[in-house]
């Protein structure tokens, strides 16, 4: 058993049949010593009396939250929660495997530059009694500051009798340079709590390897004279980390028709201008990707070409 | 993905054009590594992150954007003092923090270089002869050295006296390449970052 | 033919809500991102937010915490729609649809004004 936060408290569990479960003494946190009972949740059935209880937890049946009371009043509460582990393997029942980029990816996060910001995201199917808290830190053995915020609902989603639940959560690097070289990897620990289970999930990674820029901005194209070709133009996003000689972007500009089956032109340049043919009806595309390293690519942005 | 062959200005800054066929080499020998050593840890996730010029060099900070001084968490800062002449100067106002930073990238090279030859002498050893350095790689810093053209004594290449162990050997030669790939991309974007300023 | 519907633009009071629909039809839209971009008279077109098939929302800084995209996968058509609340009069624009297979497809727009 271990505190999860004040007065919240986690079992682990060996969780098989008849397993024998986990002995746990529980003590009231009063300078009373005499006339105390102890109930579970809403009930008023008196479980024991005196200063400690113990209590075997071996299922969902034995988790909750004991209180111990004198002559009526509330003295202190304990919540126990259940963290499962089956054939040696903690639960994950309540987020969904995302199977992107690989099994058991259950938490997904992307950087729009190198400043030290980055969200991650996470689905369930979970709608109600669920709580979350993130905490991240660079390194594991001699922890470096990362704070992130609370984690909130961004989207649902629904696939016919199911709906599925999109959280997300921004973190920052306390003091993050954008031209350090990685060595310690960022880490992210997700624990969720569903009614009385508690399971925590974590993921690991560089800030090199989840940077995936926001598209070109400002998009346009400018006809050349007596020509079926354009000149489009764009410009850095925003978002992405300066100088931008220094974190330079390279782009990839895609001309497609309405079609499926109509070939796409492609061409890849590290210059924010480029002269292509524009077809009627056709589109005109720009993503972006950063030069040197090359993780994701940006998603696209895009005009028409009429 | 291979980076296009950039055939450089004639009045370009003269390293850019080896910085870039840099970090394609040692992109494409960490690519290979990778596929030829897959039973072994060779991805960037079963890997120790190490630096092997830790300590002896400063390329990071020396190198640094003028922007990014103020960054306060970028000022790290290590002193190191470094030989100041080099032709990557050549008929350019510098100031000594730049020509810290082309000394600093220099000393990596040569210390990147000493470790790869001294691996490579392992790896031709190897009864497997599963995998050897690319010859390319090796070509590559040596002409990103001489464009350099730092004065500095030659390092006698490490000789061992031991039994090679090659599948350490292998595993480290995982490791330098992880951290030479990083460290290639900080000279790249130093190389692009000069050449527009 | 593919066909991106919108509707649920309209006049709204600084403070309200509207909730915008697109109903995208014509191609299998399962696996593809949709989103909703806005353009105000004079300005660039910009995302609002947007949505994968898989995971990884995203909402401009501007309309944090005040709108709210979800989808809808049905057998032939995908359904986006942009629940927008605690709107302020610098959210008038004409909201765009917009989804990403293989290339891009934009809806005609719908006018949301937000005035008192």
């Known amino acids: 058993i271990w505190e999860l936060k004040k007065d919240v408290y986690v079992v682990e569990l060996d969780w098989y049949p008849d397993a024998p479960g986990e002995m746990v003494v529980l003590t009231c946190d009063t300078p009373e010593e005499d006339g105390i009972t102890w109930t579970l949740d809403q009930s008023s059935e008196v479980l024991g009396s005196g200063k400690t209880l113990t209590i075997q937890v071996k299922e969902f049946g034995d988790a909750g939250q004991y209180t111990c009371h004198k002559g009526g009043e509330v003295l202190s509460h304990s919540l126990l929660l259940l963290h499962k582990k089956e054939d040696g393997i903690w639960s994950t029942d309540i987020l969904k495997d995302q199977k992107e980029p690989k099994n058991k990816t259950f938490l997904r996060c992307e950087a729009k530059n190198y400043s030290g910001r980055f969200t991650c995201w996470w689905l369930t199917t979970i709608s109600t009694d669920l709580t979350f808290s993130v905490k991240s830190s660079r390194g594991s053995s001699d922890p470096q500051g990362v704070t992130c915020g609370a984690a909130t609902l961004s989207a649902e989603r629904v696939r016919g009798d199911n709906k599925e639940y999109e959280y997300s959560v921004e973190c920052q690097e306390d003091s993050a340079c954008p031209a350090a070289e990685e060595s310690l990897p960022i880490e992210v620990m997700v624990d969720a709590v569903h009614k009385l289970k508690y399971e925590n999930y974590t993921s690991s990674f560089f800030i090199r390897d989840i940077i995936k820029p926001d598209p070109p901005k400002n998009l346009q194209l400018k006809p050349l004279k007596n020509s079926r070709q354009v000149e489009v133009s764009w410009e850095y996003p925003d978002t992405w980390s300066t100088p931008h000689s220094y974190f330079s972007l390279t782009f990839c500009v895609q001309v497609q028709g309405k079609s499926k089956r109509e070939k796409k032109d492609r061409v890849f340049t590290d210059k924010t201008s480029a002269t292509v043919i524009c077809r009627k009806n056709a589109s005109i595309s720009v993503r972006a990707q950063d030069r040197y390293y090359s993780s994701s690519w940006s998603e696209w942005a895009s005009v028409p070409c009429s | 993905r291979n980076l296009p062959v950039a055939t450089p200005d004639p009045g370009m800054f003269p390293c850019l054009h080896h910085s870039q066929n840099l970090l394609r080499a040692v992109s494409n020998m960490l690519q290979k590594a990778r596929q030829t050593l897959e039973f072994y840890p060779c991805t960037s996730e079963e890997i120790d992150h190490e630096d092997i010029t830790k300590d002896k060099t400063s390329t990071v900070e020396a190198c640094l954007p003028l922007e990014l001084t103020k960054n306060e968490s970028c000022l790290n800062s290590r002193e190191t003092s470094f030989i100041t002449n080099g032709s990557c100067l050549a008929s350019r106002k510098t100031s000594f923090m730049m020509a810290l930073c082309l000394s600093s990238i220099y000393e990596d090279l040569k210390m990147y270089q000493v470790e790869f030859k001294t691996m490579n002498a392992k790896l031709l050893m190897d009864p497997k002869r599963q995998i050897f350095l690319d010859q390319n790689m090796l070509a590559v810093i040596d002409e990103l050295m001489q464009a350099l053209n730092f004065n500095s004594e030659t390092v006698p290449q490490k000789s061992s006296l031991e039994e090679p162990d090659f599948y350490k050997t292998k595993i480290k030669l995982c490791i330098l390449l992880h951290a030479f790939r990083i460290r290639a991309v900080t000279i790249d974007r130093v190389m692009s970052y000069l050449n527009a300023s | 033919e593919v066909q991106l519907v919108e509707s649920g633009g309209g006049l709204v009071q600084p403070g309200g809500s509207l909730r915008l629909s697109c109903a995208a039809s014509?191609?299998?839209?399962?696996?593809?991102?949709m989103a909703w971009y806005r353009q105000a008279p004079g300005k660039q077109r910009e995302l609002v937010a947007s949505?994968?098939?898989?995971?990884?929302?995203?909402?401009a800084d501007s309309v944090k915490g005040r709108f709210f995209i979800s989808r809808v996968y049905a057998k032939n058509t995908n359904t986006v729609y942009l629940q927008m609340n605690s709107l302020k009069p610098e959210d008038t624009a004409v909201y765009y649809c917009?989804?990403?297979?293989?290339?891009?497809?934009w809806g005609q727009g719908t006018q949301v004004t937000v005035s008192s």
């Open positions: 014509g191609r299998d839209f399962d696996r593809s991102t």
């Open positions: 949505i994968p098939s898989d995971i990884g929302t995203k909402y």
């Open positions: 917009y989804a990403h297979i293989d290339s891009d497809y």
